[in-house]
Interface confidence: medium
């Protein structure tokens, strides 16, 4: 499998919330021995790996904001934490997963990354991961509600195993 | 094969820095997390901290103000530094890379002895 | 922090019985604790993670099983090379906490 990232860049207005967004593409084990550990952080644009570096988002760090389950389950965070820094990640039925980010700041800005690991029990793990870029803009110049960007579809799929 | 193995001097005098290294093989240092783990002589594990991908880490606050975990690619090592040592500090080191989500593979381990 | 009390701290049982250890949670954990098997003066072993899924090797009398806050490791019929001391392990969230390990021994 792989991961999709719709939308490389997110314009947004301070203030605003923006929901940021991965998906899963390819088969998906639905079987009882195969679970998906979905989560976000912050990272930088490395010259090696674009995500090998790990950064909280809001100070709350990946494990902080990961989901747990199986197959095609729908799942979203229930941590109190994250709620109370405006946070929130959810996945669907249909392999699409996300996070939210409430009250946005100047400082929210960056590259922000998804992570996706495929769990086989008894065997391996597969990772892989997505990118995407937030701006949020402050002044006349910033639009009055979140611009998306799509990737290209090159990009979209351009999914390097972490 | 994955493996990795502590290495440090044995002894350290309180109120100095403990510095331990770990070094790894097997595996690539970018693609995973590295955690210390350490156990005082007859007692539990405790969690020291980690090292992510990209060189982030994240430590117990229990030690926080005295300890620094770093790695040098070039030399496929990971080191863990904990300042102003105590006899407290006397226990067993481990370094751990993560797979599974969590501590996975083992060091053999080092005792390391706080003494004057 | 999230605290991982786990009882008994130590217990004694025959060759073939079934031995219970638990661990609770201070907060909600979902299924991310595993349990470790320590024999004596050897390095910590996965047994169980994601509360419920054996690692690989390891022999089919250990299960786990529990979600949220209880948590439970099990022997089916206990054997003389099972004496060790039993860690269970949060993995929800940083810090990372054990729990403060169970000695079990034979009869």
């Known amino acids: 499998f792989k991961v999709a990232t719709p939308y490389s860049l997110y314009v947004c207005p301070e203030g605003q919330n923006v929901t940021l967004t991965c998906r899963l593409l390819g088969p998906v084990d639905k079987g009882h021995d195969v679970t998906f550990y979905k989560t976000w952080y912050r990272s930088s644009r490395g010259e090696v790996q674009t995500c090998s570096e790990r950064r909280p988002i809001r100070n709350l760090t990946f494990q902080d904001l990961h989901l747990h389950h199986g197959g095609h389950q729908a799942a979203n965070t229930s941590h109190d934490l994250a709620q109370r820094h405006g946070l929130e990640s959810a996945s669907d039925h249909h392999g699409n997963f996300s996070i939210t980010m409430r009250n946005l700041t100047l400082l929210d800005s960056g590259l922000y990354c998804c992570l996706v690991v495929e769990i086989r029990h008894h065997h391996s793990e597969h990772r892989v991961h997505g990118a995407m870029e937030l701006q949020v803009q402050t002044g006349k110049d910033a639009p009055s509600n979140c611009v998306v960007y799509p990737s290209s579809s090159q990009d979209s799929e351009n999914i390097t195993a972490a | 094969q994955v493996q990795l193995q502590e290495s440090g001097p044995g002894l350290v005098k309180p109120s100095e820095t403990l510095s331990l290294t770990c070094t790894v093989s097997?595996?690539?240092?970018?693609?995973?997390?590295i955690s210390w783990i350490r156990q005082p002589p007859g007692k539990g594990l405790e969690w020291i901290g980690v090292?992510?991908?990209?060189?982030?880490?994240n430590y117990n606050s229990a030690f926080m103000s005295r300890v620094t975990i770093s790695v040098d690619t070039s030399k496929n090592q990971f080191s863990l530094k904990l300042s102003s040592v105590t006899a407290a500090d006397t226990a067993v080191y481990y370094c751990?890379?993560?797979?599974?989500?969590?501590?996975?593979?083992w060091g053999q381990g080092t005792l390391v002895t706080v003494s004057s | 922090d999230i605290q991982m009390t786990q009882s008994p701290s130590s217990l004694s049982a025959s060759v073939g019985d079934r031995v219970t250890i638990t661990c609770k949670a201070s907060?909600?954990?979902?299924?991310?604790v595993a349990w470790y098997q320590q024999k004596p003066g050897k390095v910590p072993k996965l047994l169980i993670y994601?509360?419920?899924y054996r690692y690989s090797g390891v022999p089919s009398r250990f299960s786990g099983s529990g979600s949220g806050t209880d948590f439970t490791l099990t022997i089916s019929s206990l054997q003389p090379e099972d004496v060790a001391t039993y860690y269970c392990?949060?993995?929800?969230?940083?810090?990372?906490?054990f729990g403060q390990g169970t000695k079990l021994e034979i009869k």
């Open positions: 751990a890379r993560e797979g599974l989500l969590l501590p996975l593979y």
């Open positions: 097997g595996f690539s240092l970018t693609n995973y997390d």
């Open positions: 090292i992510w991908t990209g060189g982030g880490t």
């Open positions: 907060q909600n954990v979902g299924t991310n």
């Open positions: 994601s509360a419920s």
């Open positions: 392990q949060q993995y929800n969230s940083y810090p990372l906490t």
